[in-house]
């Protein structure tokens, strides 16, 4: 028989999305056991029928990768999990409506920090996503978010930071003291979607000035 409360078997059914990799996750409820099995279905908002996700039927793990199935940036999606206990009890729970554009979080960028004598150069590498363009290429975050820009900060000392920002991929902080250590932080920002990545950090030391030796 079905439990009084589905939460007894199944809790916290939600999408966890980072850089457009969309993973459905859930927790077992207080009456869930290690041999409880889970089956996953998904559908596009506006569609009537649910589609069973191959590879996520009668599984015991508590996650399912729906990146491919939810890969259209302009669509909204739902997913649902059905839990069946060893004793035959079942419960089904559905996610909130999911939009990858709205809900995905941004990982720190991939950056190369290069030391020079009186400057530090930072080269941001475009972040690939799992989403494929019509030509088969993987889209980068820059392809998806028009308003994406990079915010760079260089901690010079306890009280002074230098800032740079923009949509370029190459930046350089000038006027630095040779043979000195600096802490750089670089974040991805998308203001129109209120997104800000965790920072990439690099600790770099300017090169010694050999011209006086």
């Amino acid at each position: 028989h079905a439990p009084e409360d589905p939460s007894d078997l199944l809790q916290h059914v939600k999408f966890q999305s980072s850089n457009f990799e969309n993973i459905l996750t859930w927790d077992s409820g207080p009456e869930g056991t290690p041999d409880t099995v889970y089956s996953i279905e998904y559908k596009t908002y506006g569609e009537r029928d649910w589609v069973a996700k191959k590879g996520c039927q009668r599984i015991t793990r508590k996650s399912c990768n729906l990146t491919v199935e939810t890969g259209n940036l302009t669509e909204l999606y739902y997913a649902r999990v059905t839990a069946v206990s060893a004793g035959g009890r079942s419960a089904t729970k559905m996610t909130d409506r999911f939009s990858s554009l709205q809900h995905t979080t941004l990982k720190p960028p991939d950056v190369t920090c290069i030391s020079k004598v009186r400057s530090i150069q930072m080269i941001v590498h475009p972040t690939p996503t799992p989403i494929r363009a019509g030509d088969g290429h993987r889209l980068t975050l820059e392809d998806i978010f028009h308003d994406l820009f990079y915010h760079l900060e260089l901690q010079v000392n306890r009280t002074y930071q230098m800032h740079l920002g923009g949509k370029q991929r190459e930046y350089e902080f000038f006027g630095l003291t040779p043979d000195t250590e600096f802490l750089g932080t670089i974040m991805i920002c998308v203001p129109t979607w209120a997104k800000e990545s965790a920072p990439y950090m690099c600790r770099v030391k300017t090169l010694p000035d050999r011209t006086w030796t």
Epitope: D135, I144, H151, G165, Q168, P191
Partner: antibody, heavy 117, light 107 residues
Framework: EVQLVESGGGLVQPGGSLRLSCAAS????????MYWVRQAPGKGLEFVSV????????HYVESVKGRFTISTDNAKNTLFLQMNSLKSEDTAVYYC??????????WGQGTQVTVSS | DIQMTQSPSSMSASLGDSVTISCQAS??????LFWYQQNAGQPPKLLIY???RLQTGVPSRFSGSGSGTTFTLTISGVETGDLATYYC?????????FGQGTKVELK
């Protein structure tokens, strides 16, 4: 050398349609943000629409939504602007522009669109 | 939409004068600001990006400053070729918006 060459402008009656083209060369067209920007006679500049040539993502200024459609033919390195239900206030020089290395630094010479009866 | 308010709308300058044009954003745009120069019948030409960084090939008499909501373009020692209309552009969020323009004429 980056080159952008617009065409397709002309005189059209209110309510009519026009399709602008922008032939691009000298850069990786199939992985860029491309823009249409207009300038009404004696007035300032206004961004009309943008498209990412790889993802196909588009944005429009509010005043043209539902009337204008931006698109590309990546095989021919060409940007388009389909303009329907034209109004007199759409009269302007239309420029195409592109963002390269983060900067909107390359513009075409423009094509004149006149909406008048 | 972010509004960009430019002032003055026009100004007269003698050759060699120093000229300052202001641009105010309706919200914080950090340093996401371009300055362009436009001559009649020509497309805009990029002078400054990132509020203060000089575009390659642009003479050093042009300089930009500011961040947040207040920005300035300065021409130190106006030359004949600088008589044109100047626009600021916010590159922070779509729709990208220009200031109304400042026409610099000869006194």
């Amino acid at each position: 050398e980056v080159q952008l060459v617009e065409s397709g402008g002309g005189l059209v009656q209110p309510g009519g349609s026009l399709r602008l083209s922008c032939a691009a060369s000298g850069f990786t067209f199939s992985s860029s943000w491309m823009y249409w920007v207009r300038q009404a006679p004696g007035k300032g500049l206004e961004f009309v629409s943008v498209i990412n040539t790889r993802s196909g993502i588009t944005h429009y200024v509010e005043s043209v939504k539902g009337r204008f459609t931006i698109s590309t033919d990546n095989a021919k390195n060409t940007l388009f602007l389909q303009m329907n239900s034209l109004k007199s206030e759409d009269t302007a020089v239309y420029y195409c522009a592109t963002r390269i290395q983060g900067l909107i630094d390359y513009w075409g010479q423009g094509t004149q669109v006149t909406v008048s009866s | 939409d972010i509004q960009m308010t430019q002032s003055p709308s026009s100004m007269s300058a003698s050759l060699g004068d120093s000229v300052t044009i202001s641009c105010q954003a309706s919200e914080n745009i950090g340093t996401q600001l371009f300055w362009y120069q436009q001559n009649a019948g020509q497309p805009p030409k990029l002078l400054i990006y990132g509020a203060s960084r000089l575009q390659t090939g642009v003479p050093s008499r042009f300089s930009g400053s500011g961040s947040g909501t207040t920005f300035t373009l300065t021409i130190s020692g106006v030359e004949t070729g600088d008589l044109a209309t100047y626009y600021c552009l916010q590159d922070y969020s779509w729709p990208l918006t220009f200031g109304q323009g400042t026409k610099v004429e000869l006194k």
